[in-house]
Structures are given as structure tokens and as C-alpha cells.
Amino acid sequence: MAVTACQGLGFVVSLIGIAGIIAATCMDQWSTQDLYNNPVTAVFNYQGLWRSCVRESSGFTECRGYFTLLGLPAMLQAVRALMIVGIVLGAIGLLVSIFALKCIRIGSMEDSAKANMTLTSGIMFIVSGLCAIAGVSVFANMLVTNFWMSTANMYTGMGGMVQTVQTRYTFGAALFVGWVAGGLTLIGGVMMCIACRGLAPEETNYKAVSYHASGHSVAYKPGGFKASTGFGSNTKNKKIYDGGARTEDEVQSYPSKHDYV
């Protein structure tokens, strides 16, 4: 029972995590315009992995895709790659883990095969989660570096009265979605690996049986040892776990209904 629950919960947690990774990858708010300590602008900028957007105070939003591959920063390309690898591994992991679920019967699939599939999907989820966490962390590091660089020379062209204010970017909602989703996928993967250890058939030890023949004795040992990963009870109880993920785009909101500018 505990093994089925662990496996089912691992699957659900990973499913939510991968849905979160997909959502984060598609979200436009990886970096958002820093509003703190900046002149109050009537335009709000935010950027994703695939396009950058501008929302005017009128409500008009315009997004432009990055229609170039070579012109993009290597770091952004790396983040894209990590997130896509994470999604692909996670999707394959989900597919494998569906067939590995103890509560789902497929033909005469042996428990040892299910155990192997559970372990495989678990490892895939772990790597998927790590890819997402790495991707988001690389992007966050890039933001922090750029933030302090733009703070250092926030006002350029100070030779005269004219000032050009540089737009500084800070962490967007997608980063937090990505971190949480990556963590959930990682946890789900670990749970699948733990479940795997209890899924394989328990060791069956056959005692040696002696057959006495005339003249001399021969010891015959049939069967030997069946391969097993060890502990955990095998249960036939079936429990289906269901889960879903829901993400919402960050909406720029005013601190209060009345603003003085």
C-alpha cells in the first residue's frame, strides 16, 4: 500500500511540476521592469524567453518575438535549451511512469519491469527538475548581474541637463514558477525512485534439496536467487491520485487606488 501511494504521489507531484515547467517556459514575465526607486513611467516592460512585451498605462499591450537565433545572448539560448530539455525529459518520464504505475494493469507486465520503469521515470524527473532549476537560476544570475551593472550607470549622458534613465529589470513571476515547478519535479522523481525499491518482487530463497543416489550424493539447487531490489511490502490495493497545476500571469497592480505622481 505504501509503495503504491508513494508511486502515485510521486507521479502526481511530478505531473504538477512538469506542468509548472511548461507554464514557466511559456510565460512572458521572466524579467519585469524594476519599479522601485525609478521615475514613475506610464509604460511597463517585461520579457520572456521567447518575446518581450510592453504594457502601456492605457492597457494596450504589445509583444514582439525574438525573431533571431544568432543575435540572442548565449545565456538566453542556454536557458531555453535547459528548459526544453527539462520539458522533454519530464514528458518522457510521465509517459514511462504511466505504464509503471502499480494501479494500472498492462497485459502480463512483471513487477520487475514496472520497478525498472519507475526507476527510469524517477531519474528522468530528477534530471528534468534539475534542468529547470538550473535554467531559472542561470537567468536569475544574469538578471542580478545586469541589474547591478545598470544601477552603476543608471543615469547616462550627465554632461548636460538631459538624462537618459536606463530600464532595470528584476525577477519576474516565471522565475518563481520555474523554481517551485523544478523543485516539485525533483521531489516527484525522488519519490518514484523510493517507490521503485519496494516495487520489485521480494527475494525468494529456495533451500537446497539433497537427492540421495546410489553410490554418491548430489546436491541440486533449483532456481537460485530471484533478483530483487529489496525492501517494502507488495500490496494489491489500488489508489489513483489526481492532480493539476494552475498558473496565473502576474498582473501589474497599483499599490493603492490613489496614486500621487
Epitope: V40, T41, V43, T167
Partner: antibody, heavy 119, light 113 residues
């Protein structure tokens, strides 16, 4: 077609309060910001602030925060600006305008309300 | 607040002439996110409310004659009327619509000889 109809001219005494109205028609009133602008001869145009009738969100120019108060009645598609503690400096033409969807600028204007403050 | 400086304060021209007027802002009105300049030009004829001519520094309002052209970027902007007509007699204002509070220039009064 989009129209902003403002209330008629007002003659007020110093220290009094006045409420100017701006009735919108021809578009979804709740979806656009209504701007208030002051125009005095020799002083050009001054932005007082804005209100989004749908949410009640308001932004005031710091200069006018103690002078103007914005409200909106979505049932009658009317925006209001109340000016308090009137002085002769408040004598001006007051315009309401709609902030257009593009460019943050004002695409339709009311005809203006002339306010005269005199003892 | 952003200071918008318009020049000249007035100019007198004959019909058919080309006219340029300038508007300078104390800070850049260029938004790096979409590379648009948040500057608007308005025309105010005597006894009328202002009318939007150009927004995003160079985008002409629908219905505005193509003799009106907006140009410039960052802090320096220009409104050009390629061939002035008698009906262009008005005061022209530029407006910062990037930073709150929105601010207007003092205006350029165009007079026809």
C-alpha cells in the same frame, strides 16, 4: 462616435467647491482612463490626473492632490472632478479627455468647462 | 517633473511654406522595451479643445493630413508641416506621455501672413 460632453460654465466664490462633470458616450466607459487637464492663459496645459472608471483606480498629479477629487458613475457613464477651496488661481478652462489605447495620449477631448473664481 | 521646452514660441509664415517646430524634453522619452518614443503632438485651434495629431513621436492620427510629420528620438523632437494651409493656424503642443505626471510644452503659436 466617441463623445465627451462637459458641464456648463461656472462662476464661483473663493473658498467654495465645485463639481465638474464629463459624460461619455460612443465607447465602453469602464475600459478607458478619463483624464483631466487644466488650461490657463499664459500657463499652457497642465495634467491634473486620471481615473479608470472600471476599477476606480486614480492617479493624481502631486501638485493637484489637495485640490482635485475624481469620481465616476458607471451607471450614467459620467466622470466627475471636484475642486475644493477655490481661489482665483483656479480660474481656467478644465478639459476631460479619454486616454487612447495606444501611446498613452489623449485621443478624444471634451469641449471644456470654463470656471471663473471671483469675489 | 519632466520639463518640455518648445521653440519657437511663435512663428509667422505664408501659406505653402514648410514649417518646423522643436520640442525638447529634460529626460529621454524613448522606451527601450519597444523602441518607441512616448511623445505626442496636439493642435489647438482658437476656441477649441486640443486635437491629437501625432503619437509615439511619429505615428500620425487617422484623418490627419500627411503634410504633418513627427520625427526625433530620445529628447529632441520635431513637428514638420510640409506645406502650411490657412486652416493650420493654431497653437501646437508637445506632451510627455512616458513619465508621470504627464507634462506639456508651453506651445508654439503658428500664424499665417
Amino acid at each position: 462616435q466617441v463623445q465627451l460632453q462637459q458641464s456648463g460654465a461656472e462662476l464661483m466664490k473663493p473658498g467654495a467647491s465645485v463639481k465638474l462633470s464629463c459624460k461619455a458616450s460612443g465607447y465602453t466607459f469602464t475600459g478607458y482612463w478619463i483624464e483631466w487637464i487644466k488650461q490657463r492663459p499664459g500657463h499652457g496645459l497642465e495634467w491634473i490626473g486620471e481615473i479608470l472608471p472600471g476599477s476606480g483606480s486614480i492617479k493624481y498629479n502631486e501638485k493637484f492632490k489637495d485640490k482635485a477629487t475624481f469620481t465616476a458613475d458607471t451607471s450614467s457613464n459620467t466622470a466627475y472632478m471636484q475642486l475644493s477651496s477655490l481661489t482665483t488661481e483656479d480660474s481656467a478652462i478644465y478639459y476631460c479627455a479619454r486616454k487612447g489605447l495606444r501611446g498613452n495620449s489623449f485621443d478624444y477631448w471634451g469641449q471644456g468647462t470654463t470656471l471663473t473664481v471671483s469675489s | 517633473d519632466i520639463v518640455m521646452t518648445q521653440s519657437p514660441s511663435s512663428l509667422t509664415v505664408t501659406a505653402g511654406e514648410k514649417v518646423t517646430m522643436s520640442c525638447k524634453s529634460s529626460q529621454s522619452l524613448l522606451n527601450s522595451g519597444n523602441q518607441k518614443n512616448y511623445l505626442t503632438w496636439y493642435q489647438q485651434k482658437p476656441g477649441q479643445p486640443p486635437k491629437r495629431l501625432i503619437y509615439w513621436a511619429s505615428t500620425r492620427e487617422s484623418g490627419v493630413p500627411d503634410r504633418f510629420t513627427g520625427s526625433g528620438s530620445g529628447t529632441d523632437f520635431t513637428l514638420t508641416i510640409s506645406s502650411v494651409q490657412a486652416e493650420d493656424l493654431a497653437v501646437y503642443y508637445c506632451q510627455n506621455d512616458y513619465y508621470y505626471p504627464f507634462t506639456f510644452g508651453s506651445g508654439t503659436k503658428l500664424e499665417i501672413k
